[in-house]
């Protein structure tokens, strides 16, 4: 039959070449001469000419050694034609299977494999997997079947069989207990891969097993007992540095220390932190220590790691005896800020209060006092007793020194320690109001028209506090009531000044007496400028011909000078007949008023 069974050809054949493989034969050769040919990769297409066929005999030849790892199988077609070139058979499949020879050693995928395992793990724990490849066939033969083994282990501690390797998977695992990073941090295994499932060619590689740190070592104090001296009252003072050693990997969570005060700090005076570089425990004061209350503290400090212990380990404890050093403490005023009510205007030498300080120290130290800041200079302080007395007039209304009725004084206490220390206290004098100020109108100068005059509203102010203020009462004095009226409004805080009779354009003094609710009277002279105008006015219109009240021409200025000279020369006469003169001025004004009125009527 025109059929060829698959042809098996071992790779790496030694020849000689060409080498016969098989004879193609068609049974049609009885009837006619047959010519044979082959096609396909390895014959007439790349790789060309590996196989050939003798045209007349049909012998299939191999022309070179084959390499299974390059091409494992060739699929060719055999053809049979008659002398005239006509095909006498269908193309025939020719399968040439290249059989494997063990011509490759195993090759590890890396020269050095790196793996890691936690110290102290149980036998059976997987560490890593190594891989070796072999190009030879591992399906139909053992040529490419790799078996793994461990050739050697360095170091051989605690013994030489700490690891095993699975012969077929290459998985390295722990076989013995006793892995201790602190003793052996790394193992170097020489591993072997052997083909023929362990009976063939061998290759080696290195597997480095890093032993990872577990927190199997507790930090230990060195030393375990500490003694420290700390000045009292200091906050944030470094008391002591506690040193620990830990055999685990430096700067790892298994090495970094965590400190806790587990006893002796009932008052919560201390805190302990870990120094980031040295890993020491830094003990500091959280609150100031008080020598007088407790001169020694015995603290118990425990140390653990940031990471929990991997195995049960005892926790180390250190003892720190802290001696409190006595410090000369400053006297403390009691209270630190003292509020005292005192009436303003009390007589000089009158006692204000006693303000004293206490010394926290146990010794009976002498305390002396003095005033540190007394802005108005109103007070004195007895150095021995702390008695504060008035030496000036306390004035509640003094806006320069008094704010919201309070006068603030700072006092100082000094002990006789070595060196002496000082403490300060604040004395807040709340000044009680006295009716020592009368009411005052504002403004004290007005300008008003002598025809249809507008009422002048003046505000009344009184520096005192209620009840020494409104309601106010107003009264015109010194005959000012002839031409003027003064009325306090309903609220009692303003006074309305009105011109009730015509006055010629000039400046006049209006004598206004105001009294407060406590009948404190204050006389104020209002300077009234009367202008020739109607209704509302700001300044007098037109040239000013009046005396001292106006400004204007040179004649007016001369007139003023003349009046002044006359006043100096005849001063006594003026004093004697002052009232008559004043009346004469208002009378002249009255005559003028009557004339103006007459003029108006004629008009």
């Amino acid at each position: 039959d025109w059929v060829v069974a698959p042809i098996s050809v071992p790779e790496n054949g030694k020849g000689p070449f060409p080498q016969r493989l098989n004879q193609l034969k068609s049974n049609k050769d009885r009837d006619t001469k047959i010519f044979y040919s082959i096609t396909g990769p390895g014959a007439d297409s790349p790789p060309e000419g590996v196989f050939a066929v003798e045209k007349e005999t049909g012998w299939l030849l191999l022309n070179k050694p084959l390499d299974r790892e390059e091409i494992a199988k060739y699929e060719l077609f055999g053809h049979a034609v008659s002398e005239n070139g006509a095909s006498v058979e269908d193309p025939m499949n020719i399968s040439i299977i290249v059989t494997d020879q063990n011509d490759h050693k195993p090759k590890f995928t890396q020269d050095t494999f790196r793996g890691s395992v936690l110290e102290g793990v149980l036998p059976g724990t997987s560490v890593m997997q190594v891989t070796a490849t072999d190009e030879d066939d591992a399906i139909y033969t053992y040529n490419g079947v790799v078996a793994y083994s461990i050739h050697s282990q360095e170091p051989k501690d605690p013994h030489d069989l700490m690891f095993t390797i699975h012969r077929s998977t290459g998985t390295i695992s722990v076989i013995s207990s006793g892995l201790d990073r602190e003793k052996v941090p790394e193992y170097t295994l020489t591993i072997q891969a052997t083909d023929m499932d362990g009976d063939g060619s061998t290759t080696t590689a290195v597997a480095v097993v890093e032993i990872l740190d577990a927190n199997d070592n507790a930090p230990m104090f060195e030393p375990q007992k500490y003694e420290a001296w700390v000045p009292e009252n200091e906050v944030g003072h470094e008391v002591q540095r506690l040193t620990v050693t830990d055999l685990d990997v430096p700067n790892s969570p298994a090495w970094r220390a965590t400190y806790h005060i587990v006893g002796g700090d009932d008052g919560d005076h201390f805190t302990i932190t870990t120094h980031p570089e040295t890993n020491q425990g830094v003990l500091t004061t959280k609150k100031g220590l008080d020598f007088e209350a407790q001169d020694q503290h015995t603290l118990y400090v425990e140390v653990t790691n940031e990471a929990p212990f991997a195995v049960k380990l005892p926790t180390a404890t250190a003892t720190v005896v802290v001696h409190v050093k006595d410090v000369n403490e400053a006297p403390v005023f009691v209270p630190p800020s003292k509020v005292v009510e005192v009436q303003e205007g009390i007589p000089t030498g009158e006692p204000v209060c006693v303000y004293t300080a206490e010394d926290p120290d146990k010794e009976n130290q002498k305390i002396s006092y003095r005033i540190l800041r007394d802005p108005a200079g109103w007070l004195a302080m007895d150095p021995d007793s702390g008695q504060v007395t008035a030496v000036g007039t306390l004035d509640r209304e003094d806006e320069q020194f008094v704010r919201n009725n309070i006068y603030e004084v700072m006092v100082l206490a000094m002990d006789n320690g070595s060196p002496p220390t000082t403490g300060t206290g604040t004395l807040l004098l709340t000044l009680i109001d006295v009716n020592d100020h009368g009411p005052v109108p504002e403004p004290r100068q007005i300008t008003i028209c002598n025809q249809s005059p507008v009422r002048q509203v003046l505000n009344i102010t009184d520096k005192d506090l209620s009840p020494h203020t409104s309601p106010f009462q107003a009264q015109l004095t010194d005959d000012s009531d002839i031409y003027w009226t003064a009325e306090v409004n309903e609220e009692g805080d303003t006074v309305v000044l009105s011109l009730k009779k015509f006055l010629k354009q000039d400046t006049y003094d209006v004598h206004l007496s105001l009294s407060d609710h406590g009948n404190k009277e204050q006389l104020t002279v209002i300077r009234a400028t009367v202008c020739d105008c109607h209704g509302h006015v700001e300044t007098c219109p037109g040239p000013w011909k009046g005396g001292s009240g106006g400004g204007g021409s040179g004649a007016g200025v001369i007139a003023v000078i003349v009046v002044v000279v006359i006043a100096i020369v005849a001063g006594i006469v003026v004093l004697v007949i002052s009232r008559k003169k004043r009346m004469a001025k208002y009378e002249k004004a009255e005559i003028k008023e009557m004339g103006e009125m007459h003029r108006e009527l004629n008009a």
């Epitope: 000689p16 060409p18 016969r20 060309e48 000419g49 050939a52 299939l60 022309n63």
Partner: antibody
């Protein structure tokens, strides 16, 4: 009838070169592997070179490797042997022979004489 | 390389007599051996291939056989044209190697 006929032999000095030819007829030359075989003056036969039918692969014994080159021109039905660096021990009758039935040496030529002498 | 030891180097025999020539292979070559004859004019012809297969046109008095590493050519009844040189060639190992030859002479 398969016929092969050698030519190109002659006298050559040691170190010289010579090219032998072999003309084939009567068979499909391109389908057969071809060889050169020599017979020394003491009548011993020695294989010299072989070439595959397509000319892709060549084979030599160590004695001539690097000095002799076998080649073929299937279009001209001719086989060649280029000889260089000739030595006195290369003196021989050179035959061209074909493979047949996939084995050596089915058909032989009459031979051509090569004499290497100073 | 593989050595083929051919014996005898020469042999005298009479017409009609049967003779055997032997080649011994120094390594295993399987059946990969041929026998050649060389005429006095130098013409060479293959007689037997694959140890025992006769080439076309070769008389049936010629036969080949093998016994282990010894390979034999037997001529059952010598004829006058048979008194020539005979050579063996192995093609089971590279390089191809020949026997030294046997000269068959008429007695």
């Amino acid at each position: 009838v398969q016929l092969v006929e050698e030519s190109g032999g002659g006298l050559v000095k040691p170190g010289g070169s010579l090219k032998l030819s072999c003309a084939a007829s009567g068979f499909t030359f391109s389908s057969y592997a071809m060889s050169w075989v020599r017979q020394t003056p003491d009548k011993r036969l020695e294989w010299v070179a072989t070439i595959s039918s397509g000319g892709h692969y060549t084979y030599y014994p160590d004695s001539v490797k690097g000095r002799f080159t076998i080649s073929r021109d299937n279009a001209k039905n001719t086989l060649y042997l280029q000889m260089s660096s000739l030595k006195s021990e290369d003196t021989a009758m050179y035959y061209c022979a074909s493979y047949y039935y996939g084995i050596p040496f089915g058909y032989w030529g009459q031979g051509t004489t090569v004499t290497v002498s100073s | 390389e593989l050595v083929m030891t051919q014996s005898p180097s020469s042999l005298s025999a009479s017409l009609g007599e049967g003779v055997s020539l032997t080649c011994r292979a120094s390594q295993d070559i399987g059946i990969n051996l041929i026998w050649l004859r060389q005429e006095p004019d130098g013409t060479i012809k293959r007689l037997i291939y694959d140890t025992s297969s006769l080439d076309s046109g070769v008389p049936k008095r010629f036969s080949g056989s093998r016994s282990g590493s010894d390979y034999s050519l037997t001529i059952s009844s010598l004829e006058s044209e048979d008194f020539v040189h005979y050579y063996c060639l192995q093609y089971g190992s590279s390089p191809l190697t020949f026997g030294a030859g046997t000269k068959l002479e008429i007695k």
